[in-house]
């Protein structure tokens, strides 16, 4: 069971300081951006991180959403990352959900975050280069200290 608590506005970056944004095709991508670019591309660069209480505490349970014309929420259904047009729900009556991730700081690096899927244990949000695009994907952690699954989360206010 997950119950919504509060929401924050955040900018999410990978460890190469590329900014996560949702493109016109609703794809989550990373791109080099100055602070000015980041502001100019808002609200596509501003993510609503909603925190949830968890009946089985396993870290901070969160959803990641973005509001352009409508609110879309990040999902890892079938291990494929996509944004689905939906509000983060108040309650989820299950111990796993495709839209719930456990946000945890990297041991020894309090400012670096990882997001583990609640549906697929051991699978994390990651940045992966595909041709000339840097995509947000779901990836099984295969090596300790994998930088591709680490992010910084900066609160908007």
């Amino acid at each position: 069971y997950f119950g919504k608590l509060e929401s924050k506005l955040s900018v999410i970056r990978n460890l190469n300081d590329q900014v996560l944004f949702i493109d016109q095709g609703n794809r989550p991508l990373f791109e080099d951006m100055t602070d000015s670019d980041c502001r100019d591309n808002a609200p596509r660069t501003i993510f609503i991180i909603s925190m949830y209480k968890d009946s089985q505490p396993r870290g901070m349970a969160v959803t990641i959403s973005v509001k352009c014309e409508k609110i879309s929420t990040l999902s890892c259904e079938n291990k494929i990352i996509s944004f689905k047009e939906m509000n983060p729900p108040d309650n989820i009556k299950d111990t796993k959900s495709d839209i719930i991730f456990f946000q945890r700081s990297v041991p020894g690096h309090d400012n670096k975050m990882q997001f583990e899927s609640s549906s697929y244990e051991g699978y994390f949000l990651a940045c992966e280069k595909e041709r000339d695009l840097f995509k947000l994907i779901l990836k099984k952690e295969d090596e300790l200290g994998d930088r591709s699954i680490m992010f910084t989360v900066q609160n908007e206010d």
Epitope: E6, I46, I48, K67, E69, I71, D90
Partner: antibody, heavy 118, light 107 residues
Framework: QVQLQQPGSELVRPGASVKLSCKAS????????MHWVKQRPGQGLEWIGN????????NYDEKFKNKATLTVDTSSSTAYMLLSSLTSEDSAVYYC???????????WGQGTTLTVSS | SIVMTQTPKFLLVSAGDRVTITCKAS??????VAWFQQKPGQSPKLLIY???NRYAGVPDRFTGSGFGTDFTFTISTVQAEDLAVYFC?????????FGGGTKLEIK
Amino acid sequence: QVQLQQPGSELVRPGASVKLSCKASGYTFTSYWMHWVKQRPGQGLEWIGNIYPGTVNTNYDEKFKNKATLTVDTSSSTAYMLLSSLTSEDSAVYYCTRDYYGGGLNYWGQGTTLTVSS
Amino acid sequence: SIVMTQTPKFLLVSAGDRVTITCKASQSVSNDVAWFQQKPGQSPKLLIYYASNRYAGVPDRFTGSGFGTDFTFTISTVQAEDLAVYFCHQDYSSPRTFGGGTKLEIK
């Protein structure tokens, strides 16, 4: 910086129509919902409706569906509200206001004072 | 549409007092509630969004809390410049709605 510029006042005759304007600057006009809010003297705030300039999708409060029509001109980054069949009940301050990233309305115009009088 | 019932309508307080305003939604609005301050002759200003987040530049004496149907806005230590009308607002669903307002007057 973000600015929403509205004319200070409009005086119109009962039964006529008026088109109020709101010129936006300092941000990507097509990326945020624009809202219109009515405030009668000494009264509270009433939400009229909103428009998403990127797609021109609109929502209205039922009370204002036959009174207000929201439009935009993306080339000039201007939002408009047409108010029709005006009566003294329509005399009020009308604000345009922009959505924050997810919650609230963080930028407001100075408001246009509409006076309906013969 | 969702009705936001705001109480009290008026508050007469002294500088330094603690003030609490409540808003009750007619159905759950999650945490999609904002609070605004409107000073005489001015446009409203956003103070709190997502029920509890202080907007940039807002002094920390202003706080908000609540979830679902019951929301609270508090000014921990009222100052003379806080003379204004305060409104709650739900942006959970369309049509968006405002509370009736609370007029804060300083003795």
